[in-house]
């Protein structure tokens, strides 16, 4: 049999730096663990060690730390240039800055392939791009042949900024003609690398005719044999076998997310091609990897411009934005406003002359803003002073709710009001009318929303029974601060942005920001 | 599509030695092992051994180290056994495979 | 070595009827196991790898489970081209072991 490692990543976005164990800005250096210093050692340790090493990479490398702000993409062409990844499928934060921002800095300075067989350009742009991307690529390992098919998910031009000039097809349909292709190739052994989401993983692995391992991203999913070596809780053991509708075992792999882990994957094939084996874990990039020193350095020099950038004006307040505990814990607070307004016109995508916008609402818990910004230091906002707002390094994410889910969340955030607990809610496109004269869990006598499917935007009641589009913290989706309905049902999650981005991006956008109170959270006692 | 193509059926001698071939085509015959197994009536399948023809490398089953030596040439994509000091316990169907895929057998009867 | 016990050792079943074939592994495989079919002029085919993974051109009747150390092979119903001789093979470490055969017969 001839045996293939596959090392794999997914949904780095950004964490060219160690970081703390849960991604964040690294503090203690002995306990930080990924970066891609680090990686580098791992690969090459590996790569020293057995015969046939692939290293791919399954989307979402842009968005999400200053790094990407800065460089804009241009540091993950280097620095996957330097690890020397053999291939790359496109993820939907690929295309954040537009096309425009995928193409110059990394589909043009790439050393490798950047793979998608369901993304089809069109009209300009398919001249343009041509080539930069593609859909397959047939890679030489050792004296075999591995083809390499890509797929990005379909949600895209709801989640980035694609443009009208690319068009995302269903993947399974556009994957079989490229695998087919591969097949009248000779090419006997094919891997699927892509990024919509560990079901579509499993759907590929299942439908797709020819593919004979999945490495995928988008939903950071953990999968491990055996005792997991950090805080990560296994979605189910690594690899995750799929039985494919003509009867083929087909591991599926995905490697959480934020550069923690090097998927590690060990391939048996027989002379057909066939997986006749497989198994590995993801492993843990903690401190006891050392980080190459010349990938450190590199980075060291890299990191210069980001530390001018943080003191640069964004843009200018001309009120004091109210972000203080007092405030955003208790009522509407500016700042709450502030961030949820960014949060929305982060989401603008007019892909349906239907609706104005795919999405109106937003949520944001008051315990996420961590610190006000006062306008009488010449109006100033700077990216270190966002840091100061919202330090925790998360993403605002796109989900869907139904509109009973809602309620309760909204029920929650006044459960125990009073007592400067982080769950009180801001929001965006949504009133709230709270009465808390009444009992916990029955506290919301008003609750109206921003319709989406309208040319004239204006509020109506909720609906239980209908699904929303919401903008919210990652940390929401994930249940945090008691909000265990959201993550028990919803019914799709995909993440963002980086926080301070999002709203640093708005900042300088509209150069000069005023944001109000005005209503949108409101108190009444007895009948309104 | 993969296929072995084995030698033709050998007598021998007792105490004799005897070479059989396997030709492979169809696939990179460089970076696959090829087993070899025995067949006897009444006796079941036994596996003999195996070797990488890309570097040569060979992993014996320790009832028959001494009795097969496997060899391989890349450049004609054909593996070898040879059988020595040959005794009427060694006659018997002899296959090459892939881990997918068989050659149709080598009938060696030793007999004096 | 790891010992590979089939059973039965030989099998008599109709036309249309569903057979199981079984072989225990004395220690453990890892689902790294095959199962091949000899014909009468004693050609090798290969029906399931990896447990249970269907080699392609193998008619669906075919499938490959496992419990624990127990390997089967199930034929859901028998057609007249099935009545041959079966084996599987474990090759999880060396030396890779054959299970003793199931010689299937029409009744």
């Known amino acids: 049999a001839w045996e293939l490692t596959i090392l794999h990543t997914n949904d780095v976005h950004s964490r060219l730096e160690q970081t703390s164990e849960d991604s964040s800005k690294c503090v203690n250096a002995s306990r930080c663990m990924g970066g891609v210093a680090r990686l580098f050692t791992k690969v090459q340790q590996i790569r020293r060690a057995e015969p046939n090493v692939l290293l791919l990479d399954a989307g979402d490398q842009y968005q999400g730390t200053i790094w990407f702000t800065v460089y804009k993409g241009a540091e993950v062409a280097h620095f996957m240039n330097a690890l020397r990844y053999d291939a790359m499928a496109l993820g939907n934060h690929e295309f954040d800055n537009g096309v425009e921002g995928l193409i110059e800095p990394l589909l043009k300075e790439a050393k490798f392939p950047i793979l998608s067989a369901n993304i089809k350009a069109k009209g300009p742009l398919a001249s343009q791009i041509s080539g930069l991307y593609l859909p397959y690529k047939v890679l030489p390992v050792g004296d075999e042949v591995v083809g390499i098919v890509g797929y990005t998910s379909k949600e895209t031009p709801f989640l980035s900024n694609p443009g009208t000039n690319l068009v995302f097809e269903d993947e399974i349909t556009a994957l079989q003609p490229e695998v087919d292709k591969l097949k009248t190739l000779n090419v006997n052994k094919i891997i699927a690398l892509g990024h919509s989401g560990f079901e579509m993983d499993k759907l590929i692995a299942q439908k797709v005719r020819g593919v004979d391992v999945v490495v995928g991203g988008h939903s950071n999913t953990f999968l491990y044999t055996g005792n997991p070596p950090s805080k990560e809780v296994p979605a189910g053991k690594y690899p995750f076998i799929v039985t494919s509708d003509d009867g083929r075992k087909v591991p599926v792999v995905q490697a959480y997310a934020f550069g923690k882990y090097l998927g590690y994957l060990k391939i048996e094939f027989d002379e057909r091609g066939n997986v006749i084996s497989s198994h590995g874990n993801p492993i843990l990039l903690n401190s006891s990897i050392p980080e190459d020193p010349s990938i450190k350095a590199d980075i060291n020099k890299w990191r210069i411009k980001l530390d001018n950038y943080s003191t640069q004006e964004l843009g200018k307040t001309i009120v004091y934005l109210d972000g203080s505990s007092q405030s955003c814990r208790f009522r509407e607070c500016n700042m709450g406003n502030l961030i949820c307004d960014a949060m929305i016109n982060n989401n603008l995508r007019h892909t349906d002359e239907m609706f104005w916008n795919h999405v109106s609402m937003c949520i944001l818990n008051g315990g996420g803003i961590r610190s006000p910004i006062d306008e009488r230091n010449n109006g100033t906002i700077t990216w270190e002073n966002l840091a100061a707002v919202l330090p925790f390094g998360g993403t605002f994410d796109l989900v869907q709710l139904k509109g009973s889910t809602l309620k309760k969340a909204f029920e929650h955030s006044v459960h125990r009001y009073g007592q400067s607990t982080g769950e009180f809610l801001q929001v965006g496109g949504i009133h709230v009318v709270y009465d808390l004269s009444r009992k916990p869990g029955d506290r919301v006598v008003k609750l109206d929303v921003l319709c989406t499917k309208c040319r004239v935007p204006s509020y109506d009641p909720l609906k239980m029974d209908e699904v929303y589009k919401v903008i919210l913290p990652n940390f929401l989706a994930n249940g945090g601060d008691g909000f265990q309905m959201i993550k028990d049902e919803l019914l799709r999650h995909d993440s963002g942005d980086q926080d301070i981005n999002v709203v640093s991006t708005y900042i300088s956008k509209m150069k000069v920001i005023y944001p109000a109170v005005e209503g949108r959270i409101k108190f009444s006692t007895g009948s309104h | 599509q993969v296929q072995l193509q084995q030698s033709g059926a050998e007598v021998v001698k007792p105490g004799a030695s005897v070479k059989i071939s396997c030709k492979a085509s169809g696939y990179v015959f460089s970076s696959y092992w090829i087993n070899w197994v025995k067949q006897r009536p009444g006796k079941g399948l036994e596996w003999i051994g195996k070797?990488?023809?890309?570097?040569?490398?060979?992993d014996y089953n320790g009832n028959f180290k001494g009795k097969a030596t496997l060899t391989a040439d890349k450049s004609s994509s054909t593996a070898y056994m040879q059988l020595s000091s040959l005794t009427s316990e060694d006659s018997a169907v002899y296959f090459c495979?892939?881990?997918?895929?068989w050659g149709q057998g080598t009938l060696v009867t030793v007999s004096a | 070595d790891i010992q590979m016990t089939q059973s039965p050792s030989s099998l008599s079943a109709s036309l249309g009827e569903r057979v199981s074939l079984t072989c225990r592994a004395s220690q453990d495989i890892g689902e790294r196991l095959i199962w091949l079919q000899q014909e009468p002029d004693g050609t090798f085919k290969r029906l399931i790898y990896?447990?249970?993974s269907l080699d392609s051109g193998v008619p669906k009747r075919f499938s490959g489970s496992s419990s624990g150390s127990d390997y089967s092979l199930t034929i859901s119903r028998l057609e007249s081209e099935d009545f041959v001789d079966y084996y599987c093979l474990q090759y999880a470490s060396s030396p890779y072991t054959f299970g003793g055969g199931t010689k299937l017969e029409i009744k």
């Open positions: 990896a447990t249970s």
């Open positions: 495979a892939g881990f997918a895929d």
């Open positions: 070797i990488f023809p890309g570097n040569g490398d060979t």
